[in-house]
Interface confidence: low
């Protein structure tokens, strides 16, 4: 099974202190990349029970093995479903928790029910908050039946579920008629898909015998040990505080795991920790009772003590659950509960024994899956055991699964049973993805999905020139980072190819697909130097620059001219695309811009040294507008312009220029040039009669300046059609010009 | 600044009805329970009824049920107590409070019941 | 319903001295759910303490509660001038309930 808890923490009186925190125990759980697998989910799941809408609960994730769900602000937040899901694939495992309401009317004797295919359930709702209505039971949040209020027996309302079937499963409540949903008792009945002590497809395998309150799962008949016990058969107490398969996590807090609901994979469901039981978990076990909700009596014999977390603890010269047992009989030591092992190698399995009188080699064997049993190579004799060493063969898929060893004396006999878990090394079903390059290094993330099985231990990265005989290099990087490629050839092709390896001997796999990688060219090296520049306008420059002369090639594709306006925090770059180009053209600038402008030699991708910078200021733009612009007819073709100069002129004006616009036409404008600046008045000749006209003008002086405002005016009327307009300045008849 | 403020109480004839009010401010009122609580002339502490944020689950201490009723209004963030029947031993002062659930966290400063003829 | 009792029904002590304030519930309390308020004259009551041993904000470390199943204990360590006032125990496990309170006065 998955190795996911979700933890709910139940001091309730103040649902700002609640939490629920879902950790996993899975090799690389929950770091959200193809490699590693999808991340840990922890949720509510207001499908069947809906609560009112609050502020957003907060999710924390604390490494990638734990996320935790804050931000509870009213009781009614924490009524309902939760769920996280965790691993990757088709170990993607969801474990619920359903949370009641402490002030609810009704409440459940016992959250979660676990009960075999064919069994009856009884699902009890205690009465905490009488009310004389009937109470209603819901499945899956859909109605089921009714119970008068006169039905209760003994404060209790009891819902009998005759020969359950698996999809009986789910989610059940009782509530009083006319009552708020959160005031319900709400359950979770678990309904294996087999009979007491089966799994499998078709139920026909025996399940191993879960011990301490451990539940079979009936797809795979792993047991389910409940939090606080670990091994195959949940055969060892973790110590105290501890969870998790292997007693790896430890609860949070100085009061241990006092307090905290455990939720597990299906078929276990949810119980207070080993040594808690109440609805709160807050309660320890009375004298003589152990385990998660204290549900396990110790019974211990022959002088034992009930330890509340760990069942019975035997004097000196007994030993069993309840210290039935004389150490006479032989006894396995220390056998792991799980063992794993790579696909294809050849392990030592070590199973030591004691016993009076003593084991010796012949009297040790271990058993696979499929019954073959295999016969120590060797035995070492200690005083006080003998451990027998065993060859096994070379491993196969199907060798996964319970191994036992089993130790016979003339004193009795003894057997442990284990797991033996067989992996497949991982192998990358992609190539390494090119992150960076330049001309003598590659920066290479080898983060890629593999097939077969994690945590992955180590990465190696081969690579060597395309099209080569030559040896492959090879780097050992970390998983997680990315690696570079360094002393490469430039303009080079790399062939790269990433091997995965998982922990324990025979552990690498195979080759992942090759990808072509290749180097950058070289950097180019010569400085440019800008040599003049020239203002051709208030938006133009023209810049000239050399380059040092060297032997042989130029190493380069071109120049990138670069010019930095400080005030506005703007880069404009231009691109000169020959190397043998010395000047260019720079147009589109600001007017009356402050400008730093520098060259560089580009190759490739890569840029060479920047010229030292010069510093270039372009003449501001034109002058304001001419001020009061004033059209008067003077006949059928002919229209004066007066005007007055612009205000507060940078330098004497050059020209006017006149903008003549047929008012509603679709023709472009015409614009006429007054060469006369010291004029403020023009005659425009050559116009059509009783046509409506628009003008506009403006001033040059280094560049044009802004337009006035547009006057109307109409000629006078029934004249022939005209030519086109032309303009006549005062004390300029003779000189007309279109 | 978290406030309840009570206000309705008065002088009112046995069998006589009265409508108290509370107003809330300074928190969330739609996420919180709410509880009226009394206290008679000289005496102690007595529940009166609690109304969950929905406004869907009310309940009543046994002195009073089929009397009086709680509600709410969270849009206008005020929490009500309807009085009907009054009887003398009615009379106390009425104070609204914010249940955190069951423990009064947050408590108005009261509003005067007075059942007399 | 749960009947609360509260002992002594006066306690007379000076500034500085160590108070024991004692509250029984006619049945046992789920999950410690016990509550302590001050109330002092023409003043609403205060929450102190609840979840039995859960101090609320901005009380000072003076006071501390203690108990569970019937038996609950509010202690002031220190007594300061603005501590003289009335104490009542109130259980929210099921239907609240207040005991008649305890009368704190200077000696």
């Known amino acids: 099974a998955v190795d996911l808890t979700l933890l709910a923490n139940l001091r309730l009186t103040d649902p700002q202190r609640f939490f629920l925190t879902c950790v996993s125990g899975e090799a690389g759980a929950g770091r959200g990349s193809d490699a590693w697998g999808p991340p840990l989910l922890l949720e509510k799941d207001d499908r069947i029970v809906r609560t009112p809408p609050g502020p957003p609960l907060r999710l924390a994730r604390n490494g990638s093995h734990q996320v935790t769900l804050r931000g509870f602000s009213k009781p009614s937040d924490l009524v309902g479903v939760f769920s996280c899901v965790g691993g990757a694939g088709a170990r993607r495992t969801r474990v619920i928790y359903v949370h009641n309401s402490p002030g609810a009317h009704l409440l459940p004797d016992k959250v979660t029910h676990t009960v075999n295919k064919g069994d009856t359930a009884v699902l009890s709702a205690r009465v905490h908050k009488e009310k004389q209505t009937d109470v209603i039971w819901k499945s899956n949040g859909s109605y089921f039946y009714t119970l008068d209020w006169h039905e209760a027996q003994d404060g209790r309302f009891l819902l009998q579920l005759p020969n359950v079937q698996p999809p009986s499963s789910g989610i059940y409540s009782a509530t009083y008629l006319e009552a708020s949903p959160l005031g319900s008792a709400f359950f979770r009945l678990i309904v294996r898909g087999c009979g007491a002590g089966r799994w499998g497809p078709g139920c026909t395998k025996e399940c191993p015998g879960c011990l301490h309150g451990g539940v079979c799962h009936d797809h795979d008949g792993e047991c389910v040990c409940p939090p606080g016990f670990t091994g195959t058969r949940c055969e060892q107490a973790c110590r105290e505080g501890r969870f998790g398969q292997s007693c790896q996590e430890q609860c949070p807090g100085i009061s241990g795991c006092r307090g905290l609901t455990f939720c597990l994979p299906d078929p276990y469901g949810c119980s207070c920790g080993s040594g808690w039981r109440g609805s709160q978990c807050q309660e320890a076990c009375a004298p003589g009772h152990f385990g998660a909700d204290c549900r396990l009596q110790c019974q211990c014999q022959n002088g034992g003590t009930c330890d509340r977390f760990s069942g019975c603890v035997c004097p000196s010269g007994w030993h069993g659950v309840h210290c039935e047992k004389s150490d006479r009989i032989p006894q396995i030591l220390n056998m792991a509960s799980e063992l794993e092992f790579n696909l294809e190698t050849m392990p030592r399995i070590n199973c030591a024994a004691a016993g009076n009188p003593f084991p010796v080699r012949g009297s040790i064997e271990l058993r696979k899956p499929d019954g073959t049993v295999l016969l120590s190579t060797k035995a070492i004799v200690e005083p006080e055991k003998t451990t027998a060493e065993f060859e096994v063969p070379r491993l196969v898929l199907a060798d996964s699964g319970f191994w036992e060893c089993r130790v016979s004396t003339s004193g009795g006999q003894d057997s442990r049973r284990f797991k033996v878990n067989v992996k497949v090394p991982p192998v990358p079903l992609a190539a390494p993805r090119l992150l960076t390059k330049q001309s003598r290094q590659l920066v290479v993330s080898p983060l890629v999905s593999f097939s077969g099985d994690g945590p992955i231990s180590t990465v190696r990265l081969h690579y060597r020139p395309q099209d080569s005989t030559m040896d492959w290099s090879t780097i050992v990087v970390d998983p997680s980072e990315n690696v570079t490629l360094m002393n490469l050839r430039p303009k080079t092709g790399y062939s790269v190819r990433v091997q995965l390896s998982r922990p324990g001997e025979g552990g690498e796999g195979a080759w992942g697909p090759p990808t072509l990688m290749t180097t950058d060219c070289p950097e180019p090296l010569l400085q440019p130097w800008l040599e003049g520049w020239h203002v051709e306008g208030t938006d133009r420059l023209r810049v000239s620059w050399s380059l040092p002369l060297v032997p042989g090639p130029l190493v380069g594709d071109g120049f990138l001219l670069r010019l930095w306006d400080g005030t506005r925090g703007q880069e404009r770059r231009e691109n000169v695309s020959s190397p043998q180009a010395r000047t260019a053209l720079l147009t589109g600038l600001t007017p009356g811009t402050h400008y730093q402008l520098d060259v560089q030699l580009y190759h490739c991708t890569l840029l060479g040294p920047a010229s030292p910078p010069a510093h270039v200021l372009l003449p501001p733009s034109g002058p304001p507008a001419p001020r009061h612009l004033h059209a008067q007819a003077l006949s059928d073709s002919e229209i004066q312009l007066t005007w007055k100069h612009p205000e507060a002129l940078p330098g004497p004006i050059s020209k006017y220029v006149v903008e003549v616009q047929v008012a509603g036409g679709a023709g472009d404008p015409l614009w006429i040039d007054v060469d006369r600046p010291e004029e403020t008045s023009t005659i425009i000749r050559g116009l059509n009669a009783s046509t409506r006209y628009l003008f506009r003008m403006r001033a040059s002086i280094q560049g044009l300046g802004d337009w006035s405002n547009t006057v109307e005016e109409s000629t006078l009327g029934n004249g022939l059609q005209a030519e086109g307009p032309v303009q006549e300045s005062r004390a300029a008849e003779e000189g007309l010009d279109q | 600044e978290v406030q309840l403020l009570e206000s309705g109480g008065g002088l009112v004839q046995p069998g006589g009805s009265l409508r108290l009010s509370c107003a809330a401010s300074?928190?969330?009122?739609?996420?919180?329970?709410m509880s009226w609580v009394r206290q008679a002339p000289g005496k102690g502490l007595e529940w009166v009824s609690s109304?969950?944020?929905?406004?869907?689950?009310?309940y009543y201490a046994d002195s009073v049920k089929g009397r009086f009723t709680i509600s709410r209004d969270n849009s206008k963030n005020t929490l009500y107590l309807q009085m009907n029947s009054l009887r003398a031993e009615d009379m106390a002062v009425y104070y609204c409070?914010?249940?955190?659930?069951?423990?009064?966290?947050?408590w108005g400063q009261g509003t005067m019941v007075t059942v007399s003829s | 319903d749960i009947q609360m009792t509260q002992s002594p029904g006066t306690l007379s002590l000076s500034p500085g001295e160590r108070a024991t304030l004692s509250c029984r519930a006619s049945?046992?309390?789920?999950?410690?759910?016990l509550a302590w308020y001050q109330q002092k004259p023409g003043q609403a009551p205060r929450l102190l303490i609840y979840d039995a041993s859960s101090r609320a904000t901005g009380i000072p470390d003076r006071f501390s509660g203690s108990g569970s199943g019937t038996d609950f204990t509010l202690t002031i360590s220190r007594l300061e001038p603005e501590d003289f006032a009335v104490y009542y125990c109130?259980?929210?496990?099921?239907?609240?309930?207040f005991g008649p309170g305890t009368k704190v006065d200077i000696k």
């Open positions: 109130q259980q929210y496990g099921r239907s609240p309930s």
């Open positions: 049945q046992s309390v789920s999950s410690s759910y």
């Open positions: 300074g928190f969330t009122f739609s996420h919180y329970k």
């Open positions: 109304i969950y944020p929905s406004g869907g689950w009310t």
């Open positions: 409070a914010r249940d955190r659930p069951g423990a009064f966290d947050v």
